[in-house]
């Protein structure tokens, strides 16, 4: 397994609708034809997998239908969007990239993007 540099933004603020987007860029040492991208969440020293997708040369990045993640790929970068976030989902979201094919296998893990999620204030009842 060979190491690879992965860059991602340090901080991202989710929108009021609970959507956060960030770019995950990897320094590919060669022309990979098969890439796997995994988003991990680290909170309270616990690491959990949020979503994962594999894409092949010529294809779009595809997550499972029930995934909270969507994404697009362009060259050596992946534009990731995580939806349905709430305040309790605030945490460090780490981008992990694996160059699956051709050999040799490369693995890169970013430093993480701190995503802050603020639940919207409920609208006050209004009397007319």
């Amino acid at each position: 397994c060979k190491a690879m540099h992965v860059a991602q933004p340090a901080v991202v603020l989710a929108s009021s609708r609970g959507i956060a987007s960030f770019v995950c860029e990897y320094a590919s040492p060669g022309k990979a034809t098969e890439v796997r991208v995994t988003v991990l969440r680290q909170a309270d020293s616990q690491v959990t997998e949020v979503c994962a997708a594999t894409y092949m040369m010529g294809n779009e990045l595809t997550f499972l239908d029930d995934s909270i993640c969507t994404g697009t790929s362009s060259g050596n970068q992946v534009n990731l969007t995580i939806q349905g976030l709430r305040a309790m989902d605030t945490g460090l979201y780490i981008c992990k990239v694996e160059l699956m094919y051709p050999p040799p296998y490369y693995l890169g893990i970013g430093n993480g993007t701190q995503i802050y999620v603020i639940d919207p204030e409920p609208c006050p009842d209004s009397d007319f």
Partner: antibody
Framework: EVQLLESGGGLVQPGGSLRLSCAAS????????MSWVRQAPGKGLEWVSV????????YYADSVKGRFTISRDNSKNTLYLQMNSLRAEDTAVYYC?????????WGQGTLVTVSS | QSVLTQPPSASGTPGQRVTISCSGS????????VTWYQQLPGTAPKLLIY???NRPSGVPDRFSGSKSGTSASLAISGLRSEDEADYYC???????????FGGGTKLTVL
């Protein structure tokens, strides 16, 4: 269930044109590269062309370059192959297949016959 | 003349193990994934092996693929009469910026 259905084949004279279509269903068409592969009667498989999921990249076999054009309409889930200046050696069953270099699903093919 | 070279024919008896070879170059097999396809008489090709040695779901483990350098091979163990078909290897070719197939191998089960 993934399905690919080719149409548009038939008999055409040398120098003529034909447009093949491939209707896709059972998967998110706009996420996948699509290819055309042909097989002359009694012969082996020959790759013809590929188009990336968003149409950004197109590649062709040397034997069809400048004569054939691959395109797609993601809103209609359809792949196309415009064939111009047809020659007798283009006679073959034309298959559409999913992906760039790992053809995991194939249509049943449409026969193109170039003859006078 | 195909870019990838396969023997035109192969044969074996039921239960036997047969191997089909596929030879290429550094611009295709040497640096790109090898895929194998099975084409039964009168039908469209079917994906058999991808990324050199992986089987899609539904393909029996009697079929296996391997690669070494610029050559690849498909092995079929416990040969059955229904394995009688044409087998093609394929790979992306970086120099041609296109996909290349072998000429195909006709497998006969005696």
């Amino acid at each position: 269930e993934v399905q690919l259905l080719e149409s548009g084949g038939g008999l055409v004279q040398p120098g003529g044109s034909l447009r093949l279509s491939c209707a896709a269903s059972g998967f998110t068409f706009s996420n996948y590269a699509m290819s055309w592969v042909r097989q002359a009667p009694g012969k082996g498989l020959e790759w013809v062309s590929v188009i990336y999921y968003d149409g950004s990249n197109k590649y062709y076999a040397d034997s069809v370059k400048g004569r054939f054009t691959i395109s797609r309409d993601n809103s209609k889930n359809t792949l196309y192959l415009q064939m111009n200046s047809l020659r007798a050696e283009d006679t073959a069953v034309y298959y559409c297949a999913r992906n760039t270099y790992r053809f995991d699903y194939w249509g049943q093919g449409t026969l193109v016959t170039v003859s006078s | 003349q195909s870019v990838l070279t396969q023997p035109p024919s192969a044969s074996g008896t039921p239960g036997q193990r047969v191997t089909i070879s596929c030879s290429g170059s550094s611009s295709n097999i040497g640096n790109n994934a090898v895929t194998w396809y099975q084409q039964l008489p009168g039908t469209a090709p079917k994906l058999l092996i991808y990324s050199d040695s992986n089987r899609p779901s539904g393909v029996p483990d009697r079929f296996s693929g391997s690669k070494s350098g610029t050559s690849a091979s498909l092995a079929i163990s416990g040969l059955r009469s229904e394995d009688e078909a044409d087998y093609y290897c394929g790979s992306w070719d970086s120099s041609l910026s296109g996909y290349v197939f072998g000429g195909g191998t006709k497998l006969t089960v005696l």
